[in-house]
Amino acid sequence: SVRVEQVVKPPQNKTESENTSDKPKRKKKGGKNGKNRRNRKKKNPCNAEFQNFCIHGECKYIEHLEAVTCKCQQEYFGERCGEKSMK
């Protein structure tokens, strides 16, 4: 079995609008192109500052929540899959 451990509990407030992100985008002449901005891929924190975050598991980024989680290997649990269950 595989456990998914949330790094931190996501906020209950889910009123995010899709056209906001912390990704820089090049300014386009003629105003915002909402479609292009919305569809542009953001960098994955699992390849960056969270690269070595999950000890016995795989880093997962839930983009619409902007939440990083660890998908733990069997028998491991905890925020970073660092704890082993005694079974």
Epitope: P11, T15, E16, D22, P24, A48, E66
Partner: antibody, heavy 116, light 109 residues
Framework: EVQLQQSGAELVRSGASVKLSCTAS????????IHWVKQRPEQGLEWIGC????????EYAPNFQGRATMTADTSSNTAYLQLSSLTSEDTAVYYC?????????WGQGTLVTVSA | QAVVTQESALTTSPGETVTLTCRSS?????????ANWVQEKPDHLFTGLIG???NRVPGVPARFSGSLIGDKAALTITGAQTEDEAIYFC?????????FGGGTKLTVL
């Protein structure tokens, strides 16, 4: 060790330009966004802009649009900030920092002094 | 441009829980604002703490947590320690630029 090393202090004349550098070690800047902020003496932080070094995409704060230019050289793992038409108001410490969804890694800052 | 407001100063005691908040002049702070929290210690030493409202930067102690409380972003330090004495800045994302708050000077007595 993950680190952002910034260039040394600059003393520049009013009206001139300055180019600051920010070199990453321990990580590849292509995987991050690199931001620049300004901190004037005894004041808060003012965001200047950020760059995606992978493709050169940039975003600037309204106050710095047209006067700041951010670039990046992925071969040397270095990001640059050029500021033009400097005034005494630009005397400040400038920081670079990197992250994706966080502001994880910070440089030590570069003091820029603008003289009349 | 939006204005981001923080408490100018707070004082707490070691072991206590303290919450710092971050308000937006444009209305309620939501997850769209991707609240970030940064710590500044003497000699201009900056450390990222929280990003995307809730994600703790790897290596940051678990006593630091980010959330939304009412219409504001919040940084909670559960069991403050003397080394947490610092200035804390929040930053909010507004569609195409970040705005920093003025910072909260936290004293741990």
């Amino acid at each position: 060790e993950v680190q952002l090393q910034q260039s040394g202090a600059e003393l520049v004349r009013s009206g001139a330009s300055v180019k600051l550098s920010c070199t990453a070690s321990g990580f590849n800047i292509k995987d991050y966004y690199i931001h620049w902020v300004k901190q004037r003496p005894e004041q808060g932080l003012e965001w200047i802009g950020c760059i995606d070094p992978e493709n050169g995409d940039t975003e600037y704060a309204p106050n710095f649009q047209g006067r700041a230019t951010m670039t990046a050289d992925t071969s040397s793992n270095t990001a640059y900030l050029q500021l033009s038409s400097l005034t005494s108001e630009d005397t400040a410490v400038y920081y670079c920092y990197g992250g994706t969804i966080t502001f994880a890694y910070w440089g030590q800052g570069t003091l820029v002094t603008v003289s009349a | 441009q939006a204005v981001v407001t923080q408490e100018s100063a707070l004082t707490t005691s070691p072991g206590e829980t303290v919450t710092l908040t971050c308000r937006s002049s444009t209305g309620a702070v939501t997850t769209s604002n991707s609240a970030n929290w940064v710590q500044e210690k003497p000699d201009h030493l900056f450390t990222g703490l929280i990003g995307g409202t809730i994600n703790r930067v790897p290596g940051v102690p678990a006593r630091f947590s980010g959330s939304l409380i009412g219409d504001k972003a919040a940084l909670t330090i559960t069991g403050a320690q003397t080394e947490d004495e610092a200035i804390y800045f929040c930053a909010l994302w507004y569609s195409n630029h970040w705005v920093f708050g003025g910072g909260t000077k936290l004293t741990v007595l």
